[in-house]
Interface confidence: medium
Amino acid sequence: FERTRSLQDPCSNCPAGTFCDNNRNQICSPCPPNSFSSAGGQRTCDICRQCKGVFRTRKECSSTSNAECDCTPGFHCLGAGCSMCEQDCKQGQELTKKGCKDCCFGTFNDQKRGICRPWTNCSLDGKSVLVNGTKERDVVCGPSPADLSPGASSVTPPAPAREPGHSPQ
């Protein structure tokens, strides 16, 4: 048993928030400022993430955990751990490489992020349009035309103007 213990890596005793310092006979040293170690037995501490520019600090870095960032107003997080901040658009718009653009006719976006999506085609479910769609809202489908009183007509919205491969005249 003694032999086994002497073969054990002395660094495994170093807790989170410290590192095993090779320059000081492998004693456990606290992580320097602006660095952290989230697990024990580490030979180095990781540099804290800095939330700069469009990023803002959601949680400060500590000796045992990295800083967490979110985005300044007008932007939203994208990617794991908020690796990117993407510009918000208004409802009824989508973000393109040229900035925020209004949704084309036949499409909508009810959020400040994401892209415009085609209105629901009520006729595919055998229903009629109860409320017309807008740039900000999808159509509302109602009962099927057969369920409506005589003379009622079904309105089917056209295909989105910018769906690839389609050419509005």
Epitope: S83, I115, P168, Q169
Partner: antibody, heavy 118, light 108 residues
């Protein structure tokens, strides 16, 4: 049917100029962003420039910035690329394409070859 | 600039086999902005997939796209003779618009 037809390519000496045209038909030209994309012989695709529907906003690849100018005439349904101070590395087939911004380039012309050589 | 790296450079397969093409971005790209194109010799590129996974009009359902963040995949479930071509991914998330260097799918 959507059609894009490029013209204006040819052989030009280094330092020379050339103006490419792209005639569009089969869709409402004035409603769409348009782009130029090029392809050097045996190489991949390289985006060159784009222009918004009104012609007021343009963007360029760094490799052509200050030398190329994109423009459009919506009354003629035509897209242009004015290329000045041409270099050997500008040798390529130049395609015009309808640009759906988020959704990529859904229609392309057949391309016009520009050769820059002395 | 977002660099798109495609792999493999060349894929040698037989008709009827499954083709899996990879496109890796140097930074995260919202999947809405990722497209795939097919190009045959002497022809212009043709849009296959937009929004990472939506087939363009007229594209057979043997073509499918998937992925998010930095890793995207184009899959051709059963290669037909007309599918042997070069395939490019492209991002329109930010300027400059960039394409991958291409993957050539050739007959084994």
């Amino acid at each position: 049917e959507v059609q894009l037809l490029e013209s204006g390519g040819g052989l030009v000496q280094p330092g020379g100029s050339l103006r490419l045209s792209c005639a569009a038909s089969g869709f409402t030209f004035s409603s769409y962003d348009m782009s130029w994309v090029r392809q050097a012989p045996g190489k991949g695709l390289e985006w060159v420039s784009d222009i918004d529907p009104t012609g007021s906003k343009t963007d360029y690849a760094d490799s052509v910035k200050g030398r190329f100018t994109i423009s459009r005439d919506n009354s003629k349904n035509t897209l242009y690329l004015q290329m000045n101070s041409l270099r050997a590395e500008d040798t390529a087939v130049y395609y015009c394409a309808r640009d759906l911004l988020v959704y990529g380039f859904d229609y392309w012309g057949q391309g016009t070859l520009v050769t820059v050589s002395s | 600039e977002i660099v798109l790296t495609q792999s493999p450079g060349t894929l040698s397969l037989s008709p009827g086999e499954r083709a899996t093409l990879s496109c890796r971005a140097s930074q995260s790209v919202s999947s809405s902005y990722l497209a795939w194109y097919q190009q045959k010799p002497g022809q212009a590129p043709r849009l296959l997939i937009y929004g990472a996974s939506s087939r363009a009009t007229g594209i057979p359902d043997r073509f499918s796209g998937s992925g998010s963040g930095t890793d995207f995949t184009l899959t051709i479930s059963r290669l037909e003779p007309e599918d042997f071509a070069v395939y490019y991914c492209q991002q329109s998330y930010s300027y400059p618009v960039t394409f991958g260097q291409g993957t050539k799918v050739e007959i084994k």
